[in-house]
């Protein structure tokens, strides 16, 4: 005569997060007298998953009708599966005892594996802006996926990057995993419109990878080039001097005019023009009343861009009795002078 057997036909079950897991169990006999219970794990620390007699198990339902007589199907369904539910589940027959029931026989166990999608990758750049030719680091993080196998790629404007390091944690077994990757990107002056993309591919995504993006406009600072130019005389005693501020990003910029070192006017860039590459140009002009000056005038255009140390460009107006041909200062340095005689 055969003793009761507890049969768990499935060695493993794979379920997507959010779905319902069915854990099958049947007994070959109704005796010995006593209940069946479900546990996750074995040994003294095991977790009770379902006990029909007592307890509250809102996510668990029985496959068979609980009003069915002489039931030998002890299969259960667990709803709204999360990676935390992963583990080995045991269907255990107890023998009625006094005062407590005694474990009689356990099924072989069913390993529940949970397929969980990675969270949307979050890409973050450096805390401070950097200028072209500098290398900056971007990080990409995604969490909560299972199984552990995952692929991460970096792109800049559609071109795959190769200089990055990726870690998947934890190294050992876990209910779910996280990925962390750091990519190094060399900035160029044309990167205002550039994007860095982190792409994550996982078995749960069915070939449709998740992407996280960062705009280099949040990271790059393109310092301006300055050009101070003297415009033709407007009136007998007035000179118009312009300061061309070119190819800068971001827009935050303050310009100060100095006459012989004294502040003449300060203004903030407002009506800028945008270049194709996303950088900005701006022009400021200063009307100088030459008759008010007895000596040469040194005009300085001083620009403070995005909170950085100021850069400046100077232009000398020489007050003289003899007229000379007018020109413009086209020097590329931050400071310098170009003498002009004004009548």
């Amino acid at each position: 005569e055969e003793e009761l057997q507890v049969i768990q036909p499935d060695k493993s079950v794979l379920v997507a997060a959010g779905e319902t897991a069915t854990l099958r169990c049947t007994a070959t006999s109704l005796i010995p007298v006593g209940p069946i219970q479900w546990f996750r794990g074995a040994g003294p620390g095991r977790e009770l998953i379902y006990n029909q007699k007592e307890g509250h198990f809102p996510r668990v339902t029985t496959v068979s009708d609980l009003t069915k007589r002489n039931n030998m199907d002890f299969s259960i369904r667990i709803g709204n599966i999360t990676p935390a539910d992963a583990g080995t589940y045991y269907c255990v027959k107890f023998r009625k005892g006094s005062p407590d029931d005694v474990e009689f026989k356990s099924g072989a166990g069913t390993e529940l594996s949970v397929r969980a999608k990675p969270s949307a990758p979050v890409v973050s750049g450096p805390a401070a802006r950097a200028t072209p030719q500098h290398t900056v680091s971007f990080t990409c993080e995604s969490h909560g996926f299972s199984p552990r196998d995952i692929t991460l790629k970096w792109f800049k404007n559609g071109n795959e990057l190769s200089d990055f390091q990726t870690n998947v944690d934890p190294v050992g077994e876990s209910v779910s995993y996280s990925i962390h990757s750091t990519a190094k990107v060399v900035l160029t002056r044309e990167d205002v419109h550039s994007q860095v993309i982190c792409e994550v591919a996982h078995v749960t995504l069915q070939g449709d990878p998740l992407r996280g993006t960062a705009n280099l406009s949040e990271t790059i600072r393109v310092p301006p080039t300055l050009e101070v130019t003297q415009q033709p005389v407007r009136a007998e005693n007035q000179v118009n001097v312009t300061c061309q501020v070119r190819k800068f990003y971001p827009q935050r910029l303050q310009l100060t005019w100095l006459e012989n070192g004294n502040v003449s006017r300060t203004e903030t860039a407002s009506t800028v023009t945008e270049n194709k590459d996303g950088t900005y140009n701006w022009m400021s002009w200063l009307l100088v009343n030459v008759s008010a000056h007895r000596d040469d005038v040194k005009l300085t255009c001083q620009v403070e861009h995005d909170g950085q140390p100021a850069v400046s460009k100077s232009h000398d107006l020489k007050v003289s009795a003899h007229p000379k041909e007018q020109g413009s200062n086209t020097a590329a340095e931050n400071t310098g002078s170009n003498e002009r005689n004004i009548y």
């Epitope: 006593g34 029985t62 069915k68 039931n71």
Partner: antibody, heavy 120, light 108 residues
């Protein structure tokens, strides 16, 4: 059709012994628990004993005096009654246990009963 | 031990009447209650299990309800063959299985 037929009842003196039998048919006897329930004349029902596989359960009033057993090869349930007392006088019913859900037993089929009289 | 108290002890009813029998448990037995009918000289017969599930072949006029400690067996329209003694039994916590003292339903 499920059938339970008791036998072995009779008159016995106090302190005496009696062995009741219950022949079962019409179901897979070996996988079910089976029980004895008694009813004293003019009284209500009183559970006596249940046997599962080799697991046995007794009412306090008969513990140590009665022994339940089964022979699955013969589809037969037994109740060995020793040290009988006058208060053991009753009709003894053999009953097939039924479970509902995952545990909990009640009695879905009963025999016609056999009368045991303990009297001097 | 769980004690089951049935009331009334006796009920005199005319055929066609609605009958309500009560069974009260001394502690929570969830829905683990069965009801039996016993006619004179016969073995008990299972009517209801799990408080409200009718056994196979039991007429629809028999219905059970309740959970916890208070249970009811209702016969919607009493037939002549329904006379006898009705017992409730708990199987929530055993040993021992316990029965109520019975309610005798007799002809008025």
């Amino acid at each position: 059709e499920v059938q339970l037929v008791e036998s072995g009842g009779g008159v016995v003196q106090p302190g005496g012994s009696l062995r009741l039998s219950c022949a079962a048919s019409g179901f897979s006897f070996s996988i079910y628990a089976v029980s004895w329930v008694r009813q004293a004349p003019g009284k209500g029902l009183e559970w006596v004993s249940t046997i599962g596989a080799d697991d046995t359960y007794y009412a306090d009033s008969v513990k140590g005096r009665f022994t339940i057993s089964r022979d699955n090869s013969k589809n037969t349930l037994y109740l060995q009654m020793n040290s009988l007392r006058a208060e053991d006088t009753a009709v003894y019913y053999c009953a097939k246990d039924s479970t509902v859900g995952w545990s909990g037993d009640f009695f879905d089929y009963w025999g016609q009963g056999t009368l045991v009289t303990v009297s001097s | 031990e769980i004690v089951l108290t049935q009331s009334p002890a006796t009920l005199s009813v005319s055929p066609g009447e609605r009958v309500t029998l009560s069974c009260r448990a001394s502690q929570n037995v969830r829905s683990d209650i069965a009801w039996y009918q016993q006619k004179p000289g016969q073995a008990p017969r299972l009517l209801i299990y799990a408080a409200s599930s009718r056994d196979t072949g039991i007429p629809a006029r028999f219905s059970g309800s309740g959970s916890g400690t208070d249970f009811t067996l209702t016969i919607s329209s009493l037939q002549s063959e329904d006379f006898g003694v009705y017992y409730c039994q708990q199987y929530y916590d055993w040993p021992p299985f316990t029965f109520g003292g019975g309610t005798k339903v007799e002809i008025k």
